[in-house]
Amino acid sequence: DSEEDEEHTIITDTELPPLKLMHSFCAFKADDGPCKAIMKRFFFNIFTRQCEEFIYGGCEGNQNRFESLEECKKMCTRDNANRIIKTTLQQEKPDFCFLEEDPGICRGYITRYFYNNQTKQCERFKYGGCLGNMNNFETLEECKNICEDGPNGFQVDNYGTQLNAVNNSLTPQSTKVPSLFEFHGPSWCLTPADRGLCRANENRFYYNSVIGKCRPFKYSGCGGNENNFTSKQECLRACKKGFIQRISKGGLIKTKRKRKKQRVKIAYEEIFVKNM
């Protein structure tokens, strides 16, 4: 019908506004994995900006895989309508203001700003140049406008965005909107080794964040998590060379709050940073 046609026109148009998602895995391509099962699953398509069906093989793959359309929408579309209305009308901080400072796993040394929920202020930190999370602003002003409370204790409303009702996307109206295609979410480098559910005994490596080294483990052949590498070199390249090595070189800036656990977040950025 005409409504479908209208929506199709919008989602295939290259003038779609910048998009910001909570989880990086929403940007991953659907990955059916190497196994041969035929399982109906859903993934978020960053280009159509919709959750779509795909056939999953039953093992491996990536995190952009959901059992239901509802789960996919919940994880990847951010319920933009409700969130923005809440943010702009009720003066609440966006969720990402409460994320911990996260330098990412690359080895740049870029000054950025994050909102420190303990001090209730925006503070400077050193960003590695890739990955990280949404609590990451290019300027102090931008951080303050989005995350700090105003003089009366209200959130300063500087989102400067309008909701596009047709495709539930945000149209930028000012420079307050962070850059295009920054995707943010959990990484796997700090998750424990997970054998998975099958019965194979494959030699794999996982990153042990406690000792800061890649260690071998036996993988069952299916399931598990993404802290799972076929070679030690691959494991080191993905987890150690960026994040842990930067810590050992004193690359992180100290903040006033205690950090229970350094969480690595994956983020596809519209910026490209080479692994040096």
Partner: antibody, heavy 118, light 107 residues
Framework: QVQLVESGGGLVQPGGSLRLSCAAS????????MHWVRQAPGKGLEWVSN????????NYADSVKGRFTISRDNSKNTLYLQMNSLRAEDTAVYYC???????????WGQGTLVTVSS | DIELTQPASVSVAPGQTARISCSGD??????AHWYQQKPGQAPVLVIY???NRPSGIPERFSGSNSGNTATLTISGTQAEDEADYYC??????????FGGGTKLTVL
């Protein structure tokens, strides 16, 4: 309608400098990452550099690192590429392009020719 | 960086189907994009995200990506489709990369 117009190209001697500009219109310039891509005569496309939406993060191809500097002025809706220590192999048409998802450039300028020759 | 390989040239008769390949290590795990460039002109995006067509691009252009190869397909090729075609992709932590380009000749 989105428009990107490059300028500043020309003939320069090896070791010389040039500054390219790209004037943007028809979209919210300050919300988009921008890129320079070049094409040597008769050759393929080569990504050169990019800059984040507010200008604080930049990246370069190995072939130009340390010699080229990308910048932007959001108040003027303009992207720049300062090219120093130019070499013969930098001879190319330089395009500015609007960046979307990595590797995906949805709008391109018509290009400006830079010729490095003695 | 990922390396993308394209055939230097492809020829097709008018009205026939042209297929241009772009191969790279595990390319299926990355999004592939395609650009058309006519002599003396800037590149134009014709396919993005493997198989999405920007507005204004004719329906005869389509794309696919599986295994190590992305393919641009032009059904019912017309004389005006004669051009150079470039694929591009991006591998996490590196730079955007273009294939070497394919010259499409409409016989």
């Amino acid at each position: 309608q989105v428009q990107l117009v490059e300028s500043g190209g020309g003939l320069v001697q090896p070791g010389g400098s040039l500054r390219l500009s790209c004037a943007a219109s028809g979209f919210t310039f300050s919300s988009y990452g921008m890129h320079w891509v070049r094409q040597a005569p008769g050759k393929g496309l080569e990504w050169v550099s990019n800059i984040s939406y507010m200008g604080s993060n930049t990246n370069y191809a190995d072939s130009v690192k340390g010699r080229f500097t990308i910048s932007r002025d959001n108040s003027k809706n303009t992207l720049y590429l300062q090219m120093n220590s130019l070499r013969a192999e930098d001879t190319a048409v330089y395009y500015c392009a609007r960046g979307l998802f990595p590797g995906y450039f949805d709008y391109w300028g018509q290009g400006t020719l830079v010729t490095v020759s003695s | 960086d990922i390396e993308l390989t394209q055939p230097a040239s492809v020829s097709v008769a008018p009205g026939q189907t042209a297929r241009i390949s772009c191969s790279g290590d595990n390319l299926r795990s990355k999004y592939a994009h395609w650009y058309q460039q006519k002599p003396g002109q800037a590149p134009v995006l014709v396919i993005y995200g493997d198989n999405n067509r920007p507005s204004g691009i004719p329906e005869r252009f389509s794309g696919s990506n599986s295994g190590n190869t992305a393919t641009l397909t032009i059904s019912g090729t017309q004389a005006e489709d004669e051009a150079d075609y470039y694929c591009s992709a991006y591998a996490m932590g590196s730079s955007p990369v273009f294939g070497g380009g394919t010259k499409l000749t409409v016989l």
